[in-house]
C-alpha cells in the first residue's frame, strides 16, 4: 500500500507492489532550511545531517510552550518525504538540515540569508556532488531574498521552494518569486488545486509546476517511528527537491536549466482544473504536476522548450512587458497576449548580451503580458532577422536568409493603434515555411537559429468561423518553438505556448461579427534535433 | 550473550503491592531502553512501561501510571517494577524485554507468574 | 492510536502446510512492523523485525513481506515446533508499544 502521492509521481513502468525506482539519489546532497528536525526518526535516521547553523527570531506570546516534538514536526516531516525510508521520494539522498523556523513556524529574510551563506560558504569549503536546496518557505516580496537565491543559483545549486499557502499570486512572495528558483504548488490526490481552510495553493506565473501537497503522509516527531499526514506547498516542494535528487543523481552533470526542462517535460499535463484558480491567473499557471522521468537516461536527445510569461505591463499608453529566458536557455520564439485585443505586438531584442521577449501595450489597453519560449539548444546561434513596414499591400516579409540557419519563431510589432481593423487577412504563400509575413503596417520579426542537426517545420491551424480559441499542435518527437496567429484578424488577443500546443485567443465571438475577419489561423513552429538524437544513441 | 533474567513474581493479596526484578547481563546496559509488559492468562500482550537506564527517564501505559513504577539501578544492571493496589485482574506473567525505541524487542526475560488472590 | 488487527485468530494447519497470518494497521506505519512467536509456557520471541528481515536464529521458512498499513507473516511449510501464537507489534505515541490481537496456529 503506496501512499497516493509517491504513486502519483512514479511513472507506471515503475509501479510494482513497491515504490522503489532506480537509483535513490545517492549522488546528491539536499539542504533543508526548516525548523528542528527530530534526525533519530527511523525514516530519516543516518541520512539526515543536523548541521549547527540555526537563526530563529523568538517565538511570540509569554505563554509558548516549547515542547521538542512540535518544535521538530514541520522539519521531520519534510525531510522524510524527500528522502524517507518508506514515505520518501528519494530514498537514497543524504541530507543536512540548518534551523531558520521557530517552534511556531516563523522565521526572518536575514535568517534565511544566513543560512544561504552558510550553504555557500560549505560548499566553497568541501564541494561535493549535485546540491540541493529546499526552501519550504514563504514571505512577503524581498528583492534581497530572492538576489541571495539567484547568486546561489548561479553557483550551480538547485533551489526548490514552496509557492505560499496564500492562495495569491506566488510572485507576491519570496523566494516563490525568485525566477532562479523551482516554485511549487500543491495539488490533492485528485490533482486539483489544494484548498488550506480559506485560503490555499499560490498559483500564478511564478510558479513552476505543481506536486503532491495534500494528506501527504510523512515521518512524524511523536516517536521515532510515527507517521502523520501533512498539507502545503511545503511538501509539494519536498516532493519536487526528491525527483530533483533523483533525476541529478542519474545526471550528475545537468544544470538547472535543464533539470527545470526535464521536471516540465515530465510532468503530467492538463490535469488540474483551473476553475479553482482566478480568472485572470488561469492563462499564466502552470497546469503541471510532477513526476519522475520513466527512465532515469535518455532523455538527452529531446529538444526542451517551455513557456515563461512577463510580468504585466500595466495599462499606460507606451507600457512595455519584458520575458527573459534563463542564463542557459535560447530565446527561441516571442508573442503577446493581452485580455482587452489591445496591444501593439511584440519583438526579440538584445538587452546584456542576450535576447528578451518585449510586449507593447496599446492606447486604451489595459496591459500586456510579453510570452518567451525558452528552449535547450546546445551550439546554438541565433539572431533576429527584421523587415520594417512594407510599402507594399502584399504585407511585410521576412526570412532566414543565412546558409543553415531555420526558422524558430515568427513576431509582429506595430506603431500605429488599431492595426487590422479593416484590412483583409494576409496569406502566407505556399512553398514558403521558412519566412514570417504580416501586416504591411508591421515590422516583422524572425528568430533564426543554427545549430547541429536542427530542423523545423511550420504547422497551420485555419478555422474559418469565428471560435475564441484555435490550437495547433506538434506531433511526437517534435517541440514546439514558435507560435503566432496568422496576420487579418483583427479580435485577435494574442498567441501563447501551452507545452507542445500553440493557442491563439479571440475576443468573445458574440461579439465578433462572422465576417472575414472573423477566420483565426494559429501557426505552429515545430522543430527537433537530430544531433540531440544522435548524441543519445550514442552514449546508450 | 544477552540475558533478561526476572524474579520477584508470587501470590499476593488483593490491595497488596510487590517488586519485579529484571537482571541484564551479555550487553552494555545502558544502550537499550528496558520495557516491562505482561499477560493475562489466555490473553494477548499489553505494554506497561519502560525505562531508559541511561537517563532514568519513563514512560507509562496511561492505564498503569498510578499503578507502576519503574526504577533501576545502574550498579547491578538491574530493572525494578514496582506494582501497587493489586486486584485479581493484575494476575498474569510479567515480561521484561529489551529494544532500542522504535526498533524491535529482540530479547525477552522468562517471565514470571504474579498471582493476586486472596 | 493504532489498532492492529490480525487474522485469522486462529489457524488450523497440518505439517508441511503453508500458513499465512495477516496484520493489518489502523494507519500507515511504514515497514516498522515486527514479528514474534510464543510458544505454551514461554516468552515471547522475535521473528521478523522491519516487515521482511528475519531475525538471527530464525529459520528461512519464516518470511514477513508488505508496508504500509498490510502485512503478512508466511510460513512456508510448517513444522511441528511452528505451532504456536504469533503477534505483530508497531511502535506509536501513546501508548508507544502496540501488539496485535495474536494469532493462534494450531495444529488440524
Known amino acids: 500500500s503506496i501512499p497516493w502521492n509517491l504513486e502519483r509521481i512514479t511513472p507506471p513502468r515503475y509501479r510494482a507492489d513497491e515504490y522503489q525506482p532506480p537509483d535513490g539519489g545517492s549522488l546528491v546532497e539536499v539542504y533543508l532550511l526548516d525548523t528542528s528536525i527530530q534526525s533519530d526518526h527511523r525514516e530519516i535516521e543516518g541520512r539526515v545531517m543536523v548541521t549547527d547553523f540555526e537563526n530563529v527570531p523568538e517565538e511570540d506570546g509569554t505563554r509558548f510552550h516549547r515542547q521538542a516534538s512540535k518544535c521538530d514536526s514541520h522539519g521531520t516531516h519534510l525531510a522524510g518525504v524527500v528522502s524517507g525510508r518508506d514515505a520518501g521520494v528519494a530514498k537514497g539522498a543524504s541530507m543536512r538540515s540548518l534551523r531558520v523556523l521557530n517552534c511556531q513556524g516563523k522565521g526572518t529574510v536575514s535568517g534565511t540569508l544566513i543560512g544561504l551563506e552558510f550553504i555557500r560558504k560549505s560548499q566553497l569549503v568541501q564541494p561535493v556532488g549535485p546540491l540541493v536546496v529546499l526552501l519550504p518557505l514563504a514571505g512577503g516580496y524581498s528583492r534581497v531574498l530572492n538576489a541571495a537565491c539567484q547568486r546561489l543559483a548561479r553557483a550551480g545549486v538547485v533551489l526548490v521552494t514552496a509557492a505560499g499557502n496564500f492562495r495569491d499570486d506566488a510572485c507576491l512572495y519570496s523566494p516563490a518569486s525568485a525566477p532562479e528558483v523551482i516554485t511549487v504548488g500543491a495539488t490533492n490526490a485528485q490533482d486539483q488545486p489544494v484548498t488550506l481552510g480559506t485560503l490555499g495553493t499560490n498559483f500564478g506565473r511564478c510558479v513552476d509546476l505543481f506536486a503532491p501537497g495534500e494528506d501527504i503522509i510523512g515521518a512524524s516527531s511523536d516517536c521515532s517511528t510515527c507517521f502523520v499526514s501533512q498539507s502545503g506547498t511545503s511538501q509539494a516542494a519536498a516532493h519536487v527537491a526528491g525527483i530533483a535528487a533523483m533525476m541529478l543523481s542519474a545526471e550528475p552533470e545537468l544544470t538547472l536549466a535543464e533539470l527545470r526542462q526535464r521536471l516540465i517535460h515530465f510532468s503530467a499535463k492538463d490535469v488540474i482544473n483551473e476553475a479553482w484558480f482566478p480568472e485572470d491567473q488561469r492563462v499564466l499557471t502552470p497546469n503541471l504536476v510532477a513526476a519522475l522521468p520513466p527512465s532515469t537516461h535518455g532523455a538527452g536527445w529531446q529538444l526542451f522548450c517551455r513557456t515563461v510569461w512577463s510580468a504585466h505591463s500595466g495599462p499606460t499608453r507606451m507600457a512595455t512587458a519584458v520575458a527573459r529566458c534563463a542564463p542557459d536557455e535560447e530565446l527561441l520564439s516571442c508573442s503577446s497576449f493581452s485580455r482587452s485585443g489591445k496591444r501593439r505586438g511584440e519583438r526579440m531584442e538584445a538587452q546584456g548580451g542576450k535576447l528578451v521577449c518585449r510586449a507593447h501595450n496599446a492606447f486604451g489597453g489595459e496591459g500586456v503580458y510579453a510570452i518567451a519560449r525558452c528552449c535547450l539548444l546546445p551550439q546554438a546561434n541565433c539572431s533576429v532577422h527584421t523587415a520594417p513596414p512594407a510599402e507594399a499591400s502584399m504585407g511585410t516579409r521576412v526570412h532566414c536568409h543565412q546558409q543553415g540557419h531555420v526558422l524558430t519563431g515568427c513576431s509582429s510589432h506595430w506603431e500605429v493603434e488599431d492595426l487590422g481593423t479593416h484590412k483583409p487577412p494576409v496569406l502566407r504563400p505556399r512553398g514558403q515555411p521558412n519566412q514570417c509575413v504580416g501586416h504591411r503596417e508591421a515590422s516583422i520579426h524572425a528568430s533564426c537559429c543554427h545549430a547541429p542537426g536542427l530542423e523545423c517545420k511550420v504547422k497551420e491551424h485555419g478555422i474559418p468561423a469565428p471560435q475564441e480559441q484555435v490550437t495547433v499542435a506538434c506531433e511526437e518527437g517534435w517541440t514546439l518553438t514558435g507560435c503566432s496567429a496568422l496576420p487579418g484578424t483583427s479580435h485577435v488577443l494574442g498567441a501563447y505556448a501551452v507545452d507542445n500546443t500553440c493557442v491563439v485567443r479571440s475576443r468573445d465571438v458574440s461579439t465578433t461579427g462572422s465576417t472575414s475577419e472573423g477566420a483565426v489561423t494559429a501557426v505552429a513552429i515545430c522543430c527537433r534535433s537530430r544531433h540531440l538524437a544522435q548524441a543519445s544513441q550514442e552514449l546508450q | 550473550q544477552v540475558q533478561l533474567l526476572e524474579s520477584g513474581g508470587g501470590l499476593v493479596q488483593p490491595g497488596g503491592s510487590l517488586r519485579l526484578s529484571c537482571k541484564a547481563s551479555?550487553?552494555?546496559?545502558?544502550?537499550?531502553?528496558i520495557y516491562w509488559v505482561r499477560q493475562a492468562p489466555g490473553k494477548g500482550l499489553e505494554w506497561i512501561g519502560w525505562?531508559?537506564?541511561?537517563?532514568?527517564?519513563?514512560r507509562y501505559n496511561q492505564k498503569f501510571q498510578s499503578k507502576a513504577t519503574i526504577s533501576r539501578d545502574n550498579s547491578k544492571n538491574t530493572l525494578y517494577l514496582q506494582m501497587n493496589s493489586l486486584r485479581a485482574e493484575d494476575t498474569a506473567v510479567y515480561y521484561c524485554?529489551?529494544?532500542?525505541?522504535?526498533?524491535?524487542?529482540?530479547?525477552w526475560g522468562q517471565g514470571t507468574l504474579v498471582t493476586v488472590s486472596s | 492510536e493504532i489498532v492492529l488487527t490480525q487474522s485469522p485468530a486462529t489457524l488450523s494447519l497440518s505439517p508441511g502446510e503453508r500458513a499465512t497470518i495477516t496484520c493489518r494497521a489502523s494507519?500507515?506505519?511504514?515497514?516498522?512492523l515486527n514479528w514474534y512467536q510464543q510458544k505454551p509456557g514461554q516468552a515471547p520471541r522475535l521473528l521478523i523485525y522491519?516487515?521482511?528481515n528475519r531475525a538471527t536464529g530464525i529459520p528461512a521458512r519464516f518470511s514477513g513481506s508488505g508496508s504500509g498499513t498490510d502485512f503478512t507473516l508466511t510460513i512456508s511449510s510448517l513444522e511441528p515446533e511452528d505451532f504456536a501464537v504469533y503477534y505483530c507489534?508497531?511502535?506509536?505515541?501513546?501508548?508507544?508499544?502496540?501488539f496485535g490481537g495474536g494469532t493462534k496456529v494450531e495444529i488440524k
Open positions: 524485554a529489551r529494544a532500542r525505541v522504535g526498533y524491535s524487542l529482540d530479547y
Open positions: 551479555g550487553y552494555t546496559f545502558s544502550s537499550y531502553s
Open positions: 525505562i531508559d537506564p541511561g537517563n532514568g527517564g519513563t
Open positions: 494507519q500507515y506505519v511504514g515497514s516498522y
Open positions: 522491519d516487515a521482511s
Open positions: 507489534q508497531v511502535w506509536d505515541s501513546s501508548p508507544p508499544v502496540v
